[in-house]
């Protein structure tokens, strides 16, 4: 069987992607300009470093984390980079149009790039559930819809619920997870006979996935603190995230061994569970008053993650067609919910001190905010899934799921697989 990219997609992808890029360039030309205000250069460099950390997380961390498939590692890394590059461009424009357009042009600052990178990260989390089953043309659609949905969600939450940048971006975990799961639910599920091996992990790709997990582990404190306003908040966020991810690593490795009849450690569990603490602590990372609380959260998150990795893949594989190694979706959905619940508890405690009458109202607001994030994720995810099923995208045949050779030129291979 030939490994050539199908002719129709060869025409469709470059045309679709380059037309879109041209449109983005035109939008940038007409509607954006740089922030011209006088700023201290040293401060500028420090501010850029936060953005750089986020880019490393996205490109290397999430890129490699999703590369554990035996025959889909090249595509995982490169498609992630493609989506990140496209997502950041669209997110900058969208955030600008939604937040500052009435005042004229969209002003681009390092902060807007930071926000855009985090918005694009949402797509990289979601795509874990569908990588290997879609081509680049379909991924372009996914990027555009998800970034648009997240941007609008953030604007609505900001205006209605009066949340700050950090709080409304921390819905990213739950949003990305449910978005990805709902897209996966819409895509063709069964792997035909003889191709099951391709969604298995291999040693070298698994090592690169572990490398991705390590990069994410190292930079998660930057992610959780990136949008916080004062140095004291950022310091607390960095410390608490670090304690939480440190404990979740220990929990992940020991919990993984505990969950196996022979006491063996599962690579898949570890890839995902090492990040558990960072996700669970995200919403309230700057508010946790002492290290032990962050560590307890990391412990609980690690246990939930290992438990989820043990019991949920069967269900996800059956219902959503998500391979066993793509556990980021349900992991983030559980841990994101844990993080949101912790914040609601803090809100209740805060409101108690301010007069009892408002507790129910505040809890209702928070649950409404979370529900809105989930509903928009599910609806936009289903919409994306339906769009991806359209024939015009020339989706890979089920027999060619999880296969680099469908997309890449390998000079040492004369024929396909």
């Amino acid at each position: 069987m030939s490994s050539k990219y199908p002719r129709s997609v060869r025409r469709c992808l470059p045309l679709w992607a380059l037309t879109l890029e041209a449109a983005l360039i035109l939008l940038f030309y007409f509607f954006t300009h740089y922030d011209a205000s006088l700023e201290d250069q040293k401060g500028l460099v420090a501010s850029y470093q936060v953005g750089q950390d986020l880019t490393v997380m996205a490109a290397i961390g999430l890129g490699f984390l999703t590369s554990s498939f035996r025959r889909h590692s090249w595509s995982s890394v490169a498609f992630n980079l493609f989506m990140l590059a496209l997502g950041v461009q669209w997110a900058i424009l969208l955030d600008g149009f939604l937040s500052q357009f009435p005042s004229g042009k969209v002003v681009i600052t390092l902060f807007s790039i930071r926000l855009a990178t985090m918005s694009a990260l949402s797509v990289l989390i979601s795509v874990d559930a569908v990588l290997g089953k879609v081509n680049l043309a379909q991924l372009v659609v996914m990027v555009l819809v998800e970034v648009t949905a997240l941007g609008n969600l953030r604007m609505v939450i900001s205006n209605i619920f009066n949340t700050d940048y950090h709080m409304n971006m921390m819905h990213i975990y739950v949003f990305a997870a449910y978005f990805g799961l709902s897209v996966a639910w819409c895509l063709p599920k069964p792997l035909p006979e003889g191709t099951e091996d391709k969604d298995q992990t291999a040693t070298i790709p698994s090592l690169s996935a572990m490398l991705g997990a390590l990069f994410l582990w190292m930079f998660w404190p930057s992610f959780n603190s990136a949008l916080l306003r004062s140095p004291i908040e950022r310091k607390n966020a960095v410390f608490n995230t670090y304690y939480a991810v440190a404990v979740s690593v220990v929990t992940a490795i020991s919990g993984s061994s505990l969950a196996h009849p022979q006491g063996k450690i599962s690579k898949t569990y570890v890839h995902s569970a090492v990040l558990a603490g960072g996700v669970a602590v995200g919403t309230s990372c700057h508010l946790i008053p002492s290290p032990w609380l962050a560590m307890v959260l990391g412990l609980v998150a690690g246990l939930i993650s290992v438990g989820g990795a043990k019991y949920l893949p069967g269900c996800c594989n059956r219902v959503l067609g998500i391979p066993h190694s793509s556990i980021m979706g349900y992991n983030f959905s559980l841990l994101g919910l844990l993080g949101e619940i912790i914040y609601i508890v803090l809100l209740v405690l805060d409101t108690v001190g301010a007069g009892n009458g408002m507790i129910g109202f505040q809890v209702l607001l928070s649950i409404g905010e979370l529900s809105l994030a989930i509903v928009i994720a599910l609806m936009s995810g289903l919409l994306t899934g339906l769009l991806l099923n359209l024939k015009i995208w020339k989706a890979p045949h089920e027999a060619k799921y999880f296969d680099d050779q469908v997309f890449w030129k390998f000079p040492h291979l004369a024929v396909g697989f």
Epitope: E39, D40, G43, L44, A46, S47, V50, T109, L110, F111, R114, N162, D164, Y165, M167, R229, S230, P231, I232, E233, N236, H286, L287, P289, Y343, L346, L347, L349, D350, T351, G353, A354, M358, F361, Q362, L365
Partner: antibody
């Protein structure tokens, strides 16, 4: 001693521009967010703008959005407010203020703990 | 919107004075109180509804019940005659109350 000193006020015609500055001393300027607040003659205090400690983000009051720009130079311990398209209703005493953050239970509280004495801006033809 | 009442108040030295600020929506406890005298810099008195700023006399106190915030001066001193403002810091744009002018009776 912690001090903020505003300068650059004056009389300007409607539609004109002016830049006021605020020099900080006695504290580590780069570690604090900063605000501009104004008081029109016979009126109350009105929040104008703020800028994060690292200048990465800014916010403006509805009445000045699109016309005023806040910036800072941490190497010079100076905060700026560039005012364009000035109107008669912008006539006020402009104060700069330092922002302090304190942890609440469900979020941080931000308050202005140190203020300058103000600089007067008059918009008149 | 922050609604401050009364807009002006006459009192004598030694009096107990209460100024109220009502938020149009829940701001939990994220409200600050300032004192402003003509020609001078405004001065922070109380932050986060009830925390006394260091250096501020203990006769000043703040409390909260739902969306109603109160500034109390237990025993008025001559230097306390000024205009008092509440300010919410729950969400931007930060809004001040319209002020309460405290005058000598």
């Amino acid at each position: 001693q912690v001090k903020l000193l505003e300068s650059g006020g004056g009389v300007v015609q409607p539609g004109g521009s002016l830049r006021v500055a605020c020099v900080a001393s006695g504290f580590t300027f780069r570690n604090f967010g900063m605000h501009w607040v104004r008081q029109a003659p016979g009126k109350g205090l009105e929040w104008v703008a703020f800028i994060w400690f690292d200048a990465s983000n800014k916010g403006y009051g509805d009445s000045v959005k699109g016309r005023f720009t806040v910036s800072r130079d941490n190497s010079k311990n100076t905060l700026y407010l560039q005012m364009n398209g000035l109107r008669a209703e912008d006539t006020a005493v402009y104060y700069c203020a330092r922002e302090k953050a304190v942890r609440g239970i469900s979020r941080y509280n931000y308050y202005m703990d140190v203020w300058g004495k103000g600089t007067t801006v008059t918009v008149s033809s | 919107v922050m609604t401050q009442s009364p807009s002006s108040l006459s009192a004598s030295v030694g009096d107990r004075v209460t100024i109220t600020c009502r938020a149009s929506q829940s701001i939990i406890r994220y409200l600050n109180w300032y004192q402003h005298k003509p020609g001078k810099a405004p001065k922070l008195l109380i932050h986060t509804a009830s925390s006394l700023q260091s250096g501020v006399p203990s006769r000043f106190s703040g409390s909260v019940s739902g969306t109603d915030f109160t500034l109390t001066i237990s025993s008025l001193q001559p230097e306390d005659f000024a205009t008092y403002y509440c300010q919410q810091s729950y969400t931007t744009p930060y809004t001040f109350g319209q002020g309460t002018k405290l005058q000598i009776k």
